[in-house]
Amino acid sequence: ARNGDHCPLGPGRCCRLHTVRASLEDLGWADWVLSPREVQVTMCIGACPSQFRAANMHAQIKTSLHRLKPDTVPAPCCVPASYNPMVLIQKTDTGVSLQTYDDLLAKDCHCI
Amino acid sequence: ARNGDHCPLGPGRCCRLHTVRASLEDLGWADWVLSPREVQVTMCIGACPSQFRAANMHAQIKTSLHRLKPDTVPAPCCVPASYNPMVLIQKTDTGVSLQTYDDLLAKDCHCI
């Protein structure tokens, strides 16, 4: 089990994967993407309380220093640990193309 | 040059590398680290305004969605893009050992 997977703030409130619906207009993609018309963006959202899903030693240090110097050092932040590929059908000069993006959808989250 | 390296909030206010001095006591390391007595921790601190040092497409999406749904989607966060190794002299059962940690000091920062 990963370091600190229990959320002390209540279920669903700590750093985890979350799906956010977005239209092509929301993303500013309407002029170059044909499909999908809406995107399910998986992203990392939630608080990073002490040692919750700490990514590495740097994250552990950050937690300690945030406790001591909260005005200077921010708390660790919930960010993607890895990504899932996403396929878009794009408009091109000659027609359309199927394009895969490897850094668009979060797959797993941690605190850093 | 990296995407969006100009800080619109004023010099030094956006995501960048900072050095924070910390004692072994601050870090809770006093019982297992002999040297150094103080650590110069390099960490990533600062705001991530629109497209500033965006790490990838996910970060760009996050910026767009934060603008639309600020209660749900946080702004991108300033985190290490890479690390520098750090050597600690540790206490062991038999004496001391020299240990290198690869994920302790931030080397470079980006927004994600």
Epitope: P11, G12, R16, L17, T19, V20, S35, E38, Q40 | -
Partner: antibody, heavy 114, light 110 residues
């Protein structure tokens, strides 16, 4: 744009069965697709979801490996094993879950009986 | 998986009245909630997505509200054609949540 399920039939307990969902008017490769079931006179029950772009899957905890969602270039399939009478239901294919224009198929009936 | 609880299994309201259906999530899901209407023999029809956004073609008397763990579907000026079963669904695809449905609330119009 529409989806249609097929493959539902009467089977005996323990018989494996595969249901197929075919999409019309849109490219499966860019959408999330789900399977949902509804036992006679009961509520809706989410089975699982696949992102056809990557093949990534999510399942309800009760599935416990008995059902598998997979994709081909033109279909999304639901493979079911170790069927029991409790699995008797109408099975729906859905373009979703989280689209403002979620599309549901008419459903296909699976009856498990000895 | 997340649990969605629809407190009332059935509600009855005269034509023109207001129906309120509640849905409570066992964990914090922000605005990741949809509401569906289902009539006998038909697949469900999407009414509300993202907790409060009205799906295309749905009359404005249907209103979704809520955020986090508490959600509500309100039907104002209820009509005979609104008699159906209403389900909430978590639309978050995280590993801990899943796209669970609530147990459903039957609306009877008198």
């Amino acid at each position: 744009q529409s989806v249609k399920e097929s493959g539902g039939r009467l089977v005996t307990p323990g018989t494996p069965l595969t249901l197929t969902c075919k999409a019309s008017g849109f490219s499966l490769s860019t959408y999330w697709m789900s399977w949902v079931r509804q036992a006679p006179g009961k509520g809706l029950e989410w089975i699982g979801t696949i992102y056809a772009g990557s093949g990534g899957t999510w399942y309800a905890s009760w599935v416990k490996g008995r059902f598998t969602i997979s994709k081909t270039s033109t279909t999304v399939d639901l493979k079911m094993t170790s069927l029991t009478t409790e699995d008797t239901a109408t099975y729906f294919c859905v373009r979703g879950p989280n689209y403002s224009d979620a599309i549901w198929g008419p459903g296909t009936l699976v009856t498990v009986s000895s | 998986d997340i649990v969605l609880t629809q407190t009332a299994a059935s509600v009855s309201e005269p034509v023109g009245g207001t129906v309120t259906i509640k849905c409570q999530a066992s964990e914090y899901i922000y605005s990741s909630l949809a509401w569906y209407q289902q009539k006998p023999g038909q697949p469900p029809k999407l009414l509300i997505y993202d907790a409060s956004d009205l799906a295309s073609g749905v009359p404005s008397r249907f209103k979704g509200s809520g955020y986090g763990t508490e959600f509500t579907l309100t039907i104002s000026g209820v009509q005979c054609g609104d008699a159906a079963t209403y389900y909430c669904q978590c639309t978050d695809l995280s590993s801990s949540a899943g796209n669970t449905f609530g147990g459903g609330t039957e609306v009877v119009v008198k």
